[in-house]
């Protein structure tokens, strides 16, 4: 008794396809060993036709595939364009030779069934429209025309020229003649359903002089396209339902036995299980659209259908397209945090994995928005301007060769809570979804900058200090100047590092940065942060305003300014932070709302860099103390 299981008998007709599933015992060896499909010869030899090692015989070239689904302990053999020569005995099996574990399958391919002479065969998909052509002689030009459906010996009228329509074909069947034609009438049946399949007879006239034609209608379910995706990767369902439903609402649903539960539709419905990780994008005016799902989970595996109907819900008799999605748990995409928590005023460093083989690809970070179909405007990218509202508080740090880049967002507010996507212009499977949760801060931030009302005077020396707690003692501290293409590290001086770690004094852990002499181009956002190697941690930001030295104004020592900021009451500090906010650079937003636009992000950014890149690390006049 073989532990392999499959269909013993498979029957089909010429021109069709079959999809044969073979089940194997769930063991690690079985999951990874060679799978094969071979044809049994009279001599007892089984000739391989296709195998999971990549072998494909000449007679199967271009019409067969073998896909292993280790999660299900199955493999599937798809064979298209069947001919009667494919009839025979086969084996589906496992092992390095064709004598290992196997299951015998008998395939029978028969001719297209014989119908009465003059029978025209119409093959249509569910939801589509068929036009049945009925020829008649001139003598019946003025006679009654009709179409009936054979049920056993009887033939029940579907529609006739006296305007009778069978209730089950109401609003779906019309009988008409084209132009001046005097020898053909037509019957259109729209929104086809499986029960419409069968033998039809069209007739012109009555009695022995009547003209009759036979029509065999086959209504096909959509053959699901098999999709095999890795855990945590993404999948795109490309849906093309045709021009006739271009103006109807579109949906993607997941089959659940006889129902199909809508995941997303163009009327704003969305399954909460896909919140933050789904986008529906119209592709053109002909009704084409795509649905992208990121962060695939094991439970996302299943049968999906896209369709169109004014209700945005699945409706019998409307066109659909189908997929079967398998999610492979043996994923190349690393497991990264799906939820990142921050506090108001604080910062988060989000690590985005990408395909290490594509280190030169452009990296992006976008904010998923829930409006209607979902969209994800790019906030920052390796060659994209930081979007308005994020200046001075968002930067992307690429770490070539590491297979990851880091996005830092600081000055957090509760409005920053939501879903964000990491993506590149390379391997589209490597899209990861992160949920950012920002809670109200209950204590002072770990990093504090003094002076808080940072105004530097041209030509003078300006020092700014960043206080950090002892827990950051062993980490690398840095200052960087923020610009539209990142945050460029500056020379800085860590005063806490002179002490031994045993006697860390909480009040004297300072890393300071000095501008000497201050220049106009030094104005802007500066970040103080901590990191360990390429792992970025907490950051805080401050806007440094630069002003001309007014005649007669006292020359204030930077350290006095720091002291004054420390002593200032909270209200004063708040006021100064409002003033800082008014100084934020207002750059043109560059919104990249969907996948296609994401591809163009790099090109657009190239044009913008010249104007958007004021004050980079190269032009910085920072010095170490």
């Amino acid at each position: 008794q073989s532990p392999i299981f499959g269909p013993q008998d498979v029957s089909s007709i010429e021109g069709n396809s079959v999809s044969i599933t073979c089940y194997y015992p769930d063991t690690s060896v079985n999951r990874h060993t060679r799978k094969y499909w071979c044809r049994q010869g009279a001599n007892g030899y089984c000739a391989t036709l296709i195998s999971s090692n990549g072998y494909l015989s000449k007679e199967y070239s271009g019409r067969a595939s073998l896909i292993n689904f280790p999660e299900n302990s199955t493999f599937v053999i798809n064979i298209a364009h069947l001919t009667q020569e494919d009839t025979g005995s086969y084996k589906c099996g496992l092992g390095t030779t064709n004598r290992g574990l196997f299951f015998d399958v008998s395939l029978e391919v028969s001719q297209v069934p014989e119908f009465p002479n003059d029978t025209h065969v119409y093959t249509k998909d569910i939801g589509r429209t068929v036009t049945i052509e009925c020829r008649f002689k001139e003598g019946n030009a003025h006679s009654k025309k009709s179409l009936c459906k054979k049920r056993g010996e009887a033939c029940e009228v579907v529609i006739d020229s006296t305007e009778y329509v069978d209730p089950s074909y109401k609003d779906r069947a019309i009988l008409f003649m084209k132009g001046t034609s005097r020898d053909i009438f037509y019957v259109n049946i729209s929104h086809l359903i499986p029960s419409d399949a069968g033998l039809y007879v069209c007739q012109a006239g009555e009695g022995p002089s009547a003209d009759k034609n036979n029509a065999d209608l086959q209504v096909l379910e959509p053959e699901p396209e098999l999709l095999y995706k890795d855990l945590r990767s993404s999948v795109t369902f490309e849906c093309d339902l045709g021009r006739e439903v271009a103006n109807d609402a579109k949906y993607l649903c997941r089959k659940n036995k006889e129902t199909c539960d809508v995941i997303i539709n163009t009327l704003g419905k969305r399954d909460p299980a896909f919140e933050g990780r789904i986008l529906l994008t119209p592709r053109d005016d002909n009704g084409r659209f795509s649905v992208l799902i990121t962060g695939l989970r094991k439970e996302d595996a299943g049968h999906y259908q896209c369709g169109a109907h004014s209700s945005g819900l699945p409706q019998e008799g409307w066109p659909v397209q189908a997929w079967q999605l398998f999610v492979n748990e043996e994923s190349t995409i690393p497991n990264s945090r799906s939820v990142v928590k921050g506090v108001t005023g604080g910062s988060v460093a989000i690590v985005c994995p990408y395909n290490p083989k594509e280190s030169s690809s452009l990296k992006y970070w976008c904010h998923w928005e829930a409006d209607e179909n979902g969209r994800c405007p790019v906030l920052v990218g390796t060659q994209a301007l930081v979007q308005e509202g994020y200046e001075g508080r968002l930067a992307l740090f690429d770490q070539p060769g590491s297979g990851a880049y880091t996005v830092i967002l600081n000055q957090l507010t509760t409005q920053d809570s939501g879903f964000y996507w990491c993506l590149t212009d390379g391997d589209s499977r490597w899209r990861t979804t992160i949920e950012l949760q920002v809670a109200e801060a209950t204590k002072k931030p770990d990093l504090e900058v003094t002076p808080q009302n940072a105004t530097a005077v041209i030509g003078e020396t300006f020092t700014i200090s960043c206080h950090y707690p002892c827990k950051f003692y062993s980490q690398e501290k840095y200052w960087c100047k923020w610009s539209n293409d990142g945050c460029h590290i500056l020379p800085s001086h860590d005063e806490g590092a002179r002490q031994s770690s045993v006697s860390c004094d909480q009040s004297s852990q300072i890393v300071s940065m000095t501008l000497n002499p201050v220049k106009k181009e030094d104005e802007g956002w500066y970040w103080c942060g901590v990191k360990e190697g390429q792992v970025y941690g907490e950051t805080t930001a401050i806007y440094v305003a630069v002003e001309e030295r007014t005649r007669g104004s006292p020359h204030i020592n930077p350290t006095d300014a720091n002291a004054r900021a420390k002593d200032a009451p909270e209200e004063e500090a708040m006021e100064s932070s409002v003033r800082e906010d008014e100084n934020k650079a207002n750059l043109d937003p560059r919104l990249f709302a969907d996948e296609r636009e994401i591809q163009n992000a790099g090109d657009q950014a190239q044009e913008n860099r010249a104007s958007g890149n004021a004050g980079s690390a190269g032009g910085q006049s920072g010095s170490s103390k």
Epitope: P7, D9, V10, N16, S19, P194, S195, E223, K257, E258
Partner: nanobody, 127 residues
Framework: EVQLVESGGGLVQAGDSLRLSCAAS????????MGWFRQGPGKEREFVAA??????????YYEDSVKGRFTISRDNAKNTAYLQMNSLKPEDTAVYYC??????????????????WGQGTLVTVSS
């Protein structure tokens, strides 16, 4: 909603034949699955045979112990599935259940894959 009614069970001698029928009422489409399961006295319910169809393709599955003796078939027009049982043995004695499902995916041996079940028909094979 699909209703299933089995018939054709009875008492036979070892080596005899019997044909079980399973009539389905309600909507059945151009794809679906019908299976036969059995439950012998004091035993678990077990898979016997299944038939899956998708458009013009039909797949037939059998449990090892009935291969070559039992044949599953379906009459499209009558919406009925049959189980032709030849060379019956005493160990085939059981209540035979018909199961149906609109879905043609999943392991046909798995009773959990079927949504609709008949009430069962008793087959007794005496030696």
């Amino acid at each position: 909603e699909v209703q299933l009614v089995e018939s054709g069970g009875g008492l036979v001698q070892a080596g005899d034949s019997l044909r079980l029928s399973c009539a389905a009422s309600g909507r059945t489409g151009s794809s679906g699955a019908m299976g036969w399961f059995r439950q012998g006295p004091g035993k678990e319910r077990e898979f016997v045979a299944a038939l899956m169809w998708r458009n013009t393709v039909t797949y037939k599955y059998y449990e090892d112990s009935v291969k070559g003796r039992f044949t599953i078939s379906r009459d499209n027009a009558k919406n009925t599935a049959y189980l032709q049982m030849n060379s019956l043995k005493p160990e085939d004695t059981a209540v035979y259940y018909c199961a149906a499902d609109p879905d043609t995916y999943g392991d046909p041996r798995n009773s959990g894959a079927y949504d609709y079940w008949g009430q069962g028909t008793l087959v007794t094979v005496s030696s």
